[in-house]
């Protein structure tokens, strides 16, 4: 079964920037990523960034630049300023649409006893999963 | 303007072969998945066969698998459909439809359809 | 597979007069509904995907709402055209599956 990781980090040098990043395991190919964060994007959640591998990537703000790392990850930085900055205790959620498979998505927030800087390893946290 | 037209279609007795086929224009064929979708006469809407846009990972209803196959040729904006070893149980109307992956791959547009009827 | 179960099977709403068709999904399909619009000898015409959004043409008078597996299509005020079959679809794991059909009809 197909899985979904996601990795919340705060950046050192700014305290209220956080980098996000998100992983595939599985064997399709990816048609499309979602970023969003308050939640899954069904459900409530609003849209940070999509991801499209061959049509590019759009993002919102506080997004600042969403990137492929992979074929199958993704990451992206969120501007630390303003009234719709995220905080400590915010979850992202990344959902991962492969054709003809379906989607799988994963939300992750910044661990509670994390430092600034310190990573959290990307380890799976699937929040649906296939029966 | 997007256009999906299919052709193929026709009577033929159980057992025999059809090969559907589906001219896509208005769009840039290859950047987009595509499936076949069938409705036989007050009967669900049924996604018989998918194909990814680069022609590589496909799909088949439980029912069709080892009798049909999907393919697509990107150079001449084209998909279709081998239907082998048919039964009166596919008898229905199928259509070429495109997804779109900004809108959760929703099938956006749609062909007229071409009505396949398996009768001896 | 995800099961798509459509109520009423058919509806009977005067013109300009409210109508509400349901989708139930037998396990959560996140945001991955669409309902289409099939008029008598034509193909399935998108109206919504993401469960909310709007194709492009499509009137406002249709909208969608839910979340998780239950799923309404609303048409606010019931035109003659507007008579068709409805159908959810969830594309959120394969196979794509759909609602068998909601008919609507003019009271």
């Known amino acids: 079964t197909p899985e979904v990781w996601v990795q919340v980090r705060m950046e050192a040098t700014e305290l209220s920037s956080f980098t996000i990043r998100c992983g595939f395991l599985g064997s399709g190919s990816i048609s499309l990523v979602t970023v969003s964060w308050g939640g899954p994007n069904g459900a409530g959640g609003t849209t940070l960034a999509v991801l499209h591998p061959e049509r590019g990537i759009r993002q919102w703000a506080p997004a600042r630049q969403a990137r492929w790392e992979t074929q199958s990850s993704i990451s992206l930085i969120l501007e630390g300023s303003g009234a719709s900055s995220p905080c400590a205790n915010t979850t992202f959620c990344c959902k991962f649409a492969s054709f003809p498979e379906g989607s799988w998505e994963a939300c992750g927030s910044l661990p509670p006893s994390s430092d600034p800087g310190l990573s959290a390893p990307p380890t799976p946290a699937p929040i649906l999963r296939a029966d | 303007e997007v256009q999906l037209v299919e052709s193929g279609g026709g009577l033929v007795k159980p057992g025999g072969s059809l090969r559907l086929s589906c001219a896509a224009s208005?769009?840039?064929?290859?950047?987009?998945?595509m499936s076949w979708v069938r409705q036989a006469p007050g009967k669900c809407l049924e996604l018989v066969s998918a194909?990814?846009?680069?022609?590589?990972?496909?799909y088949y209803l439980d029912t069709v698998k080892g009798r049909f196959t999907i393919s697509r040729d990107n150079a001449k904006n084209s998909l279709y459909l081998q239907m082998n070893s048919l039964r009166a149980e596919d008898t229905a109307v199928y259509y070429c439809?495109?997804?779109?992956?900004?809108?959760?791959?929703?099938?956006?547009?749609w062909g007229q359809g071409t009505l396949v009827t398996v009768s001896s | 597979d995800i099961v798509m179960t459509q109520s009423p099977d058919s509806l009977a709403v005067s013109l300009g007069e409210r109508a509400t068709i349901n989708c139930k999904a037998s396990?959560?399909?996140?945001?991955?509904v669409a309902w289409y619009q099939q008029k008598p000898g034509q193909p399935p015409k998108l109206l919504i995907y993401?469960?909310?959004h709007r194709f492009t043409g499509v009137p406002d008078r249709f909208s969608g709402s839910g979340s998780g597996t239950d799923f309404t299509l609303t048409i606010s005020s019931l035109q003659a055209e507007d008579v068709a079959v409805y159908f959810c679809?969830?594309?959120?794991?394969?196979?794509?599956?759909f609602g068998c059909g909601t008919k609507l009809e003019i009271k």
């Open positions: 439809a495109r997804h779109e992956d900004y809108y959760g791959f929703a099938m956006d547009y």
């Open positions: 208005g769009f840039t064929f290859s950047s987009y998945h």
């Open positions: 194909i990814n846009s680069n022609g590589i990972n496909t």
């Open positions: 396990q959560s399909v996140s945001n991955d």
């Open positions: 993401y469960v909310s």
């Open positions: 679809h969830q594309a959120y794991r394969s196979p794509w599956t």
